[in-house]
C-alpha cells in the first residue's frame, strides 16, 4: 500500500490521543535502556510503511502484536485516514485471524514495540535534514489530502 495520500495530521492526532498510551502500557515494566532503535524511516509515508510492517507482520519470536489494543487502533486510524487502505488489508486480516490464537508478550515483542515507538517519534516530527531540503511539513504540503 502507498501511504502517500494519507491524512498525516489526523493519524498523528490519533496516535497522540490513544495509540501512544497503549504502547506505553504494553512496554510498562521494561527498562528504558533495554532496546536500541535500529529501524528508521525517511519520510512520513515511509514511516507508515515501516509501522504497518512491524505492527501487523509476524516476525520470528513475535507473532502476536496484531491483536494488541495499539495495533487495532493503528489499523482503524489507517483505515479511516488512508484512502483505500482497508481494501488492501482484507486478505491480510483473514490470514491474521487464522494465525493468531493467543497474545504472548515475549522479549522480542517488547523490542519490536520499542522500535515502533521510535518510528512513531520520527513520524510525529519534522524530518531532520539540514537547511535547504524539505522536511515532513513540506511533504504535507505536497501530499496532504483531507478525507472525510
Amino acid at each position: 500500500y502507498d501511504f502517500t495520500n494519507c491524512d498525516f495530521e489526523k493519524i498523528k492526532a490519533a496516535y497522540l490521543s490513544t495509540i501512544s498510551k497503549d504502547l506505553i502500557t504494553y512496554m510498562s515494566g521494561t527498562k528504558s535502556t533495554e532496546f536500541n532503535n535500529t529501524v528508521s524511516c525517511s519520510n512520513r509515508p515511509h514511516c507508515l510503511t515501516e509501522i504497518q510492517s512491524l505492527t501487523f507482520n509476524p516476525t520470528a519470536g513475535c507473532a502476536s502484536l496484531a491483536k494488541e489494543m495499539f495495533a487495532m487502533k493503528t489499523k482503524a486510524a489507517l483505515a479511516i485516514w488512508c484512502p483505500g487502505y482497508s481494501e488492501t488489508q482484507i486478505n491480510a486480516t483473514q490470514a491474521m485471524k487464522k494465525a493468531r490464537k493467543s497474545k504472548v508478550t515475549t522479549n522480542k515483542c517488547l523490542e519490536q514495540v520499542s522500535q515502533l515507538q521510535g518510528l512513531w517519534r520520527r513520524f510525529n516530527r519534522p524530518l531532520l535534514k539540514q537547511q535547504g531540503s524539505s522536511d515532513y511539513k513540506d511533504d504535507d504540503d505536497k501530499h496532504h489530502h483531507h478525507h472525510h
Epitope: S20, S32, N36, R121, N124, L128, D135
Partner: antibody
Framework: EVQLVQSGAEVKKPGSSVKVSCKAS????????IEWVRQAPGQGLEWMGV????????NYNENFKGRVTITADKSTSTAYMELSSLRSEDTAVYYC????????????WGQGTTVTVSS | DIVMTQSPDSLAVSLGERATINCKAS??????VTWYQQKPGQSPKLLIY???NHYTGVPDRFSGSGSGTDFTLTISSLQAEDVAVYYC?????????FGQGTKLEIK
C-alpha cells in the same frame, strides 16, 4: 530516571569558541533527539539546533549563521554544542534537552551551562 | 521562520483565580504547540504537548487549547507555586521557535 548533566560554567574572550557537553544517563541515548536552547540574561528561550544521536543528522537555527555545531558521541552518551566567533551577546545560559517519547516535545532538560563572553 | 507571539507579556492574577496566556503563530502550525514553565534559576519544564496533552505529573488545573495559529494555556485556579514564566513553542517546522514568554505573578 533520565538525567542530562551539562559541563560547568565558562568565561570566554570575544572571537573564541566554546564547547558545552551534555551527558545523558538513564535512557537509550541514540533513540532520542537532543536539542540545544539558550537564554540570555533576563531574556526568553532561543532554539539553536538539534541532533539525532542515532545517525548524526542535525538541523540548526540559521540565525547563528554557521557558528554552531552540534555533535554526539554514542560511546559516552554525550552531546556537544560548539559555538564559534563568540561575541558579548552570546553571554547566556545554554541548555540541552531530550525529546520526549512521542517526538512532539522535549521533556528532560540539563541544568544549564553559563557562558560569559567578556574581554 | 514561524514567529510565535505571546500575550500578555506579564500577568498578575489572584490566588484561586483563572489565568489565561495566549500564543499566536505567524502561520499555521496545526496542533504542534508545546507549553513550558520556567521558574527563576531553573531549567524549563514541559507542561503540555501537542496543544492539550498533559505531561506526566502536571496538575489538571493546567490545560491547553487551540489549533492552526491561535493557542491558549489556562490555569483554572492559580496556586502560589505557579508563579513562573510560561513559553509556547511550535514543533511544526524547523527552526523550532519559542514565544517571548509570559511572566505570571500573584496579584
Amino acid at each position: 530516571e533520565v538525567q542530562l548533566v551539562q559541563s560547568g560554567a565558562e568565561v570566554k574572550k570575544p572571537g573564541s569558541s566554546v564547547k558545552v557537553s551534555c551527558k545523558a544517563s538513564g535512557g537509550t541515548f541514540s533513540n532520542y533527539l537532543i536539542e540545544w536552547v539558550r537564554q540570555a540574561p533576563g531574556q526568553g528561550l532561543e532554539w539553536m539546533g538539534v541532533i539525532d544521536p542515532g545517525n548524526g543528522d542535525t538541523n540548526y537555527n540559521e540565525n547563528f549563521k554557521g557558528r554552531v555545531t552540534i555533535t554526539a558521541d554514542k560511546s559516552t552518551s554525550t552531546a556537544y554544542m560548539e559555538l564559534s566567533s563568540l561575541r558579548s551577546e552570546d553571554t547566556a545560559v545554554y541548555y540541552c534537552a531530550r525529546e520526549d517519547n512521542t517526538g512532539t516535545a522535549f521533556d528532560y532538560w540539563g541544568q544549564g551551562t553559563t557562558v560569559t563572553v567578556s574581554s | 521562520d514561524i514567529v510565535m507571539t505571546q500575550s500578555p507579556d506579564s500577568l498578575a492574577v489572584s490566588l484561586g483565580e483563572r489565568a489565561t496566556i495566549n500564543c499566536k503563530a505567524s502561520q499555521s502550525v496545526s496542533s504542534d504547540v508545546t507549553w513550558y514553565q520556567q521558574k527563576p534559576g531553573q531549567s524549563p519544564k514541559l507542561l503540555i504537548y501537542y496543544v492539550s496533552n498533559h505531561y506526566t505529573g502536571v496538575p489538571d488545573r493546567f490545560s491547553g487549547s487551540g489549533s492552526g495559529t491561535d493557542f491558549t494555556l489556562t490555569i483554572s485556579s492559580l496556586q502560589a507555586e505557579d508563579v513562573a514564566v510560561y513559553y509556547c513553542q511550535q514543533h511544526h517546522r524547523f527552526p523550532l521557535t519559542f514565544g517571548q514568554g509570559t511572566k505570571l505573578e500573584i496579584k
